[in-house]
Interface confidence: low
């Protein structure tokens, strides 16, 4: 349905608060060194220029596309060359290519302050002074710092954001009430990021058919009871609102997601008893519980698989007729009947299918070719869940930390090229598997382990991507989506690897230690144990948890002392030395 | 919500045609293989014909070969069946579906008697 005003189509859907909040969120992903004043000035002059298009589709430049208008916009800031380099050359461009230029210089790790908390009493009064400020700072600080964010759950965190303060700064005990809603956020801020970061690179590194492979998937295991037609019609729409929220199209994903939600509340009788409680909420609440509602549970007596895709005598036929609806239907069947297994695998299976059928449907007889299919897959099954037995074990026997430091040296061993920031990131994220996982029952474990895994490992192949430093990263993060996980797990040490030089101040401490929380003098610690592992590629568990507890013993030794700053000093020279000598250095 | 509209369907003589139309809405028809299956009086489901979702694929059940013809236009989410010289034998409840599914419509009906 064409508008005469893109523009003002979705100020009138989104209302104002929402087109703002949106435009916002868009102007700090594409350019995230730009000062907080300087996006809400432009903000406010696209809402005035959205508005007299409300008033008059015809006026002058309110038939332009979004793109064009704000592309125009974003090229009006003045120290664009200076802050941004390269990027200012998108402006030379022309639409679509314009956008593309700013997308493709989107920044994962954008060098940014970290952001400190301020005391509850500061941010209780900021809050109170200038709620809306308030509130579109925390828009900005996030967008900026996570560009690939889905802006219309960006709206859900803000609002519980809001929700918190109106709550807590009221409170007694603000701080007790305030700090642990503060944490949940930003954990599961961080969390949405990561997810959506992987739906983003699967959509721009591997193609619209591989995500609408994973929504298949994905939706099948959560609406069993659902029809093909509808978890097709479902995995179309669904693919529609993630290419726009990746593409940069913020507005258009956040209304046509609200028609999503709209749609599968009208339709829930035909997708899932487990809609209802979502369906009842606000709009930004019930797109969000529809996105993390429980699997449905599963028709009963569904038949064999094997009659129609593998004894039927027409699977090759169907096939030819439409390959990636049989395979769609297939993928369909296989996941409503196992939401025991993650996504990923059901992917890999489907592939070994597709695979299977290319080849037999071409042989002299095809049927008695691809009659043990299903044989192939039963390997494919079992190696993720003895690998999630084992590192489930493992960390049971070792708790979250040492897990940790074991993923730690197993990664810095596979890939000690990458560097000791993203490495520590990585294995502290991968070794969080445990306390997610591993307490589920066996039902459970796989889906949430591997799928959580993707994630993960989809971080490192971003951060690696910016900075290309390893081959091996490059061949696991490239050659196959579902297979990455796989293609990390087997890599052995890396023979190749030039041990780097020591340097003795990689491994001098002060008493600034002492003052930071446990998490953060754990990334100490554990930054100082990859950093060890590149030293000596080849020391034992033994010797570096030798190393590692004689290190846990300076820091509490130091951090007791009256003269802590000394202590530092004159024990971490001891410490050094006798590292050098236990570990060969 | 996913919907296919059959029309088209009629009385007529024997040796004469019909064009059968499915309208389809509520899901991307392009990119589905879409299938007309049929249903005598009395008796089951039997397969007509069968359509890829690029067209390039066209296949027909050994009773209607030669005398029907499948066809789509993607664009305005239509599918058809072109059928010549009807037999009495092809009255039946005629369906459109998706893939090779079961029909979830109504259906046309087609009479050929004289």
């Known amino acids: 349905d064409a508008h005469k005003s893109e523009v003002a189509h979705r100020f009138k859907d989104l209302g104002e608060e929402n087109f703002k909040a949106l435009v916002l969120i868009a102007f700090a992903q594409y350019l995230q060194q730009c000062p907080f004043e300087d996006h809400v000035k432009l903000v406010n002059e696209v809402t005035e220029f959205a508005k007299t298009c409300v008033a008059d589709e015809s006026a002058e430049n309110c038939d332009k596309s979004l793109h064009t208008l704000f592309g125009d916009k974003l090229c009006t800031v003045a120290t664009l060359r200076e802050t941004y380099g390269e990027m200012a050359d998108c402006c030379a461009k022309q639409e679509p290519e314009r956008n593309e230029c700013f997308l493709q210089h989107k920044d994962d790790n954008p060098n940014l302050p970290r952001l400190v908390r301020p005391e509850v009493d500061v941010m209780c009064t900021a809050f109170h002074d200038n709620e809306e400020t308030f509130l579109k700072k925390y828009l900005y600080e996030i967008a900026r710092r996570h560009p690939y964010f889905y802006a219309p759950e960006l709206l859900f965190f803000a609002k519980r954001y809001k929700a918190a303060f109106t709550e807590c700064c009221q409170a007694a005990d603000k701080a007790a009430c305030l700090l642990p809603k503060l944490d949940e956020l930003r954990d599961e801020g961080k969390a949405s990021s990561a997810k959506q970061r992987l739906k983003c690179a699967s959509l721009q590194k591997f193609g619209e058919r591989a995500f609408k492979a994973w929504a298949v998937a994905r939706l099948s295991q959560r609406f069993p009871k659902a029809e093909f037609a509808e978890v097709s019609k479902l995995v179309t729409d669904l693919t529609k609102v993630h290419t726009e929220c990746c593409h940069g199209d913020l507005l258009e994903c956040a209304d046509d997601r609200a028609d999503l939600a709209k749609y599968i509340c009208e339709n829930q009788d035909s997708i899932s008893s487990k809609l209802k409680e979502c369906c009842e909420k606000p709009l930004l609440e019930k797109s969000h519980c529809i996105a993390e509602v429980e699997n449905d549970e599963m028709p009963a007596d569904l038949p064999s698989l094997a009659a129609d895709f593998v004894e039927s005598k027409d699977v090759c036929k169907n096939y030819a007729e439409a390959k990636d609806v049989f395979l769609g239907m297939f993928l369909y069947e296989y996941a409503r009947r196992h939401p025991d297994y993650s996504v990923v695998l059901l992917l890999r299976l489907a592939k070994t299918y597709e695979t299977t059928l290319e080849k037999c449907c071409a042989a002299a007889d095809p049927h008695e070719c691809y009659a043990k299919v299903f044989d192939e897959f039963k390997p494919l099954v079992e190696e993720p869940q003895n690998l999630i037995k084992q590192n489930c074990e493992l960390f049971e026997q070792l708790g979250e930390y040492k897990f940790q430091n074991a993923l730690l040296v197993r990664y810095t061993k596979k890939v000690p090229q990458v560097s000791t920031p993203t490495l520590v990131e990585v294995s502290r994220n991968l070794g969080k598997v445990g306390s997610k996982c591993c307490k589920h029952p066996e039902a459970k474990r796989m889906p949430c382990a591997e799928d959580y895994l993707s994630v993960v490992l989809n971080q490192l192949c971003v951060l690696h991507e910016k900075t290309p430093v390893s081959d091996r990263v490059t061949k696991c993060c490239t050659e196959s989506l579902v297979n990455r996980r796989p293609c990390f797990s087997a890599l052995e040490v890396d023979e190749t690897y030039v041990p780097k030089e020591f340097n003795a101040e990689t491994f001098t401490f002060h008493a600034d230690i002492c003052t930071l929380s446990e998490k953060e003098r754990q990334i100490k610690k554990q930054t100082a144990l990859v950093e060890l592992v590149k030293h000596k590629p080849k020391a034992t568990k033994e010797q570096l948890k030798a190393v590692m507890d004689d290190f846990a013993a300076f820091v509490e030794k130091c951090c007791k002392a009256d003269d802590k700053e000394t202590c530092f000093a004159e024990e971490g020279k001891k410490l050094v030395a006798a590292s050098q000598a236990a570990l060969g250095l | 919500q996913v919907q296919l509209q059959e029309s088209g369907g009629g009385l007529v003589q024997p040796g004469g045609s019909l064009r059968l139309t499915c309208t389809a809405s509520g899901f991307a028809f392009s990119s589905f293989g879409m299938s007309w299956v049929r249903q005598p009086p009395g008796k089951g489901l039997e397969w007509v014909s069968a359509?890829?979702?690029?067209?390039?694929?066209?296949n027909y059940a050994d009773s209607v070969k030669g005398r029907f013809t499948i066809s789509r236009d993607n664009d305005k989410k239509m599918l058809y069946l072109e059928m010549n010289k009807l037999k009495p034998e092809d009255t039946a409840v005629y369906h459109c579906?998706?893939?090779?599914?079961?029909?979830s419509s109504q259906g046309t009906q087609v009479t050929v008697s004289s």
């Open positions: 579906v998706i893939g090779r599914g079961s029909p």
């Open positions: 359509i890829s979702a690029d067209s390039s694929t066209k």
